[in-house]
């Protein structure tokens, strides 16, 4: 931002009215007047080129300094070409003199030379020959100097002639100011340049009303330079939640917009399933029946708990499950759904009935399911089992109520034995299986079944309460089909699978190898 | 309106003392540095004195310098011409002026002239 | 020199312009003001500065300078323009503060 000027003294907007003091009175310099577009301009100027030893001073009137610490003077001159006069007039100048004196006091027609300090010497940039002088041509220049720190309470400025011929339009002196500014939504007091070149001025902003400094960042900083200018900003605030940048300034957000947080963002329209925000809204409350969890940004719409899992089938396989089951038909809006599944199980004869999660085996831990089957095993038999899938998501833990589906199946059968070859001969085959452990009290024999590969003719059974048996004045070499089914109280078990076991060669005889 | 009105010539023999007083009226005395002018009978005109503003500066023309004081009173608006030791050669009609801006003038306001006649 | 020097006399027929001339090395330093004055009556200010006329001054009166001379020009000069005219200026030698050009009798024929 450009730097302001105040201005302590105007010489040119004073109209002649300022009456500085000349020295030595009425022989050097002078104020005189001219009119140019019926306006009268006022000089004070002086041209004895053609007397040597010329001193001639004019002293400003006193200026108050204020808060002023470094001036800068302005001045507007005219000087004539020394070769204007005859013999180039050997006294004559072509410069003259800028002093200055503080004083906490005007000292009025006293005027004492030696308290002054000399400023510089003014030269012109361009001088006025007698031509151009004869028409009314004259070369106007612009010089600036500028001094500081100043400490007393004003001051005075001097002009020396020492043999120049020289009018003086302008004598403007004023101090600097960085402007009154806002950006980045910080407001920056006016403030007084500096009186040191290579110094800044550090000023801290205000955020404007509604604005904040952003967590962690930092407070707004901006350095006033000598020259009223605004350098290297450091910071910015921010518009608070409910606010948004308008110019440089918060602006409430609109009915029917909001914004959550500090943020350079602007407001935002409720999303989705959200009740129509007041004016300066942080966020949007949901509609009656949606929800918005704790994790979900204020931009989401609200959302509702997901229905029941669309479909459940329950397969039963021997002591085995597999629940299957398609995604909820509404998902309340969301993709984060997960699925429970709990067991019950009935005995049929009593009535009774209690969770079986202790008791039976999941393909995978039944909740935060996310794909939509799983295997239940370890299913006892003869036992009426209900399977219960509940969907949910992020929000279901909002409400009370829960969306499941349930499917009940009733195991009529013990799961099949595994069946393993424990060794042969020529002769033997030893067999053994297992069930899993809840199964097996319920067992009261096993029955084994086998026959000859290729002969559906015969087959021999042979029953035993243990988990193997050697069958025993087999043919040699021949491959026979074994099949191990539990017997309860209720009626025969599933079967196992029927495998092909085959006897040794008589080669190999006499060895009972696996 | 704005006029200086002059007062206190006469006959006055070699060697006395005169006072001429100026009255200003209609513009603020105190802004302006004053003059006397004189005319002997059938010359042109000669610059005598002048006094700055505020009474501080003033500065005589060597005919006169030493014998005659300019003077003034703001408060009264008026200027005066201390005239001593006269001589024949002071016989003049005196005018007081202002100068318009500055020390040196233009002069822009004259008075009516007053005339001193210096003869035994 | 501290001296301004004008012709004694000029004289100008009726409408006709009429130029009096200042002589000086004042005037190469400081601009000439212009005074008229009738007889039994104060000067009155015609010219100041580079070419200045106060209110009430005809404009058939102008100033103008170069180098040492300063003029007066009366651009169809009228019967109560008889009278004598003066030029003033600062005195740039020290010697005086202002000085006065000896006066110039115009007649109108």
């Known amino acids: 931002a450009q730097g302001k000027e105040v201005v302590l003294l105007d010489f040119a907007a004073a109209g002649g009215e300022l009456g500085w003091l000349t020295h030595p009175y009425g022989k050097g310099w002078d104020l005189m007047q001219n009119i140019m577009n019926d306006m009268p301009i006022y000089m004070y100027s002086v041209c004895n080129v053609m007397s040597g030893d010329q001193d001639n001073w004019l002293r400003t009137n006193w200026v108050y300094r204020g808060e002023a610490e470094r001036i800068f003077i302005e001045l507007k001159f005219t000087v004539r070409d020394c070769n204007s006069f005859p013999g180039g007039a050997s006294s004559c100048k072509e410069t003259f003199n800028l002093y200055y004196a503080e004083s906490d006091l005007d000292y009025g027609t006293n005027f004492q030379k030696r308290l002054f300090t000399k400023i510089d010497t003014i030269a012109p940039d361009e001088i006025t020959v007698s031509s151009d002088f004869e028409a009314r041509h004259v070369k106007l220049n612009v010089e600036e100097r500028s001094v500081g720190p100043l400490t007393r309470k004003g001051f005075y400025l001097a002009f020396q002639d020492i043999g120049a011929c020289v009018a003086l339009l302008s004598v403007r002196v004023y101090y600097k100011k960085c402007p009154e500014l806002l950006q980045g939504l910080a407001h920056f007091p006016e403030t007084i340049a500096g009186s040191d070149a290579p110094s800044l001025a550090t000023v801290a902003g205000t955020c404007v009303d509604h604005a904040v400094v952003p967590p962690g960042g930092e407070e707004p900083r901006m350095h006033c330079a000598v020259d009223g200018e605004w350098l290297v900003p450091i910071g910015q605030c921010l518009c608070q939640a409910g606010y948004e940048k308008v110019e440089d300034a918060c602006q409430a957000c609109s009915p029917g917009f909001f914004k959550f947080e500090a943020s350079e963002s602007p407001c935002l329209e409720c999303p989705e399933h959200t009740l129509p925000s007041p004016e300066g809204a942080t966020s949007c409350e949901c509609e009656e029946g949606f929800f918005r969890a704790p994790q979900d940004p204020a931009s989401m719409p609200c959302t509702r708990p997901p229905s029941a899992p669309h479909y459940l089938t329950a397969v039963g396989m021997g002591a085995k499950v597999e629940l299957r089951w398609t995604p909820p038909q509404d998902s309340g809006g969301r993709e984060d759904i997960v699925y429970s599944v709990t067991c019950e199980q009935c005995w049929p004869e009593s009535g009774e009935c209690g969770p079986c999660e202790a008791s039976v085996r999941y393909s995978e831990p039944p909740h935060g399911l996310t794909r939509t089957s799983v295997t239940v095993s370890d299913l006892e038999p003869h036992m009426n089992y209900t399977f219960t899938v509940e969907a949910r998501n992020g929000v279901s833990g909002l409400v009370t109520s829960r969306s499941f589906r349930t499917a009940s199946v009733s195991i009529n059968q013990t799961e099949p034995p595994k069946v393993r070859l424990e060794g042969r001969s020529t002769t033997s085959l030893s067999v053994s299986w297992s069930i899993p452990p809840p199964q097996q009290s319920r067992v009261w024999k096993y029955e084994v079944t086998y026959r000859k590969k290729g002969d559906s003719n015969s087959y021999n059974v042979r029953r035993t309460e243990g988990f193997s048996v050697t069958l025993d004045d087999l043919a040699p070499d021949t491959t026979y089909l074994v099949q191990v089914q539990a017997l309860t109280q209720e009626g025969q078990g599933a079967g196992s699978k029927v495998h092909e076991f085959q006897t040794l060669s008589p080669e190999g005889s006499g060895n009972l190898a696996v | 309106q704005v006029q200086l009105v002059q007062s206190g010539g006469g006959l006055v023999q070699p060697g006395g003392s005169l006072r001429l007083s100026c009255a200003a009226s209609g513009f603020t005395f105190s802004s302006y540095a004053m003059h006397w002018v004189r005319q002997a009978p059938g010359k042109g005109l000669e610059w005598v004195t002048v006094i700055s503003h505020d009474g501080t500066n003033t500065y005589y023309a060597d005919s006169v310098k030493g014998r005659f004081t300019i003077s003034r009173d703001n408060s009264k608006n008026t200027l005066y011409l201390q005239m001593n030791s006269l001589r024949a050669e002071d016989t003049a009609v005196y005018y007081c002026?202002?100068?318009?801006?500055?020390?040196?003038?233009?002069?822009?306001?004259w008075g009516q002239g007053t005339l001193v006649t210096v003869s035994s | 020199s501290s001296e301004l020097t004008q012709p004694p006399s000029v004289s100008v027929a009726p409408g006709q312009t009429v130029t009096i001339t200042c002589q000086g090395d004042s005037l190469r330093s400081y601009y000439a003001s212009w005074y008229q004055q009738k007889p039994g009556t104060a000067p009155k200010l015609l010219i100041y500065g580079e070419n200045n006329r106060p209110s009430g001054v005809p404009d058939r009166f102008s100033g103008s300078s170069s180098g040492t001379s300063a003029s007066l020009t009366i651009t169809g000069a009228q019967a109560e323009d008889e009278a004598d005219y003066y030029c003033n200026s600062r005195d740039s030698s020290g010697t005086h503060l202002t000085v006065f050009g000896g006066g110039t009798k115009l007649t109108v024929l």
């Open positions: 002026a202002r100068a318009s801006v500055g020390a040196t003038g233009p002069f822009d306001i």
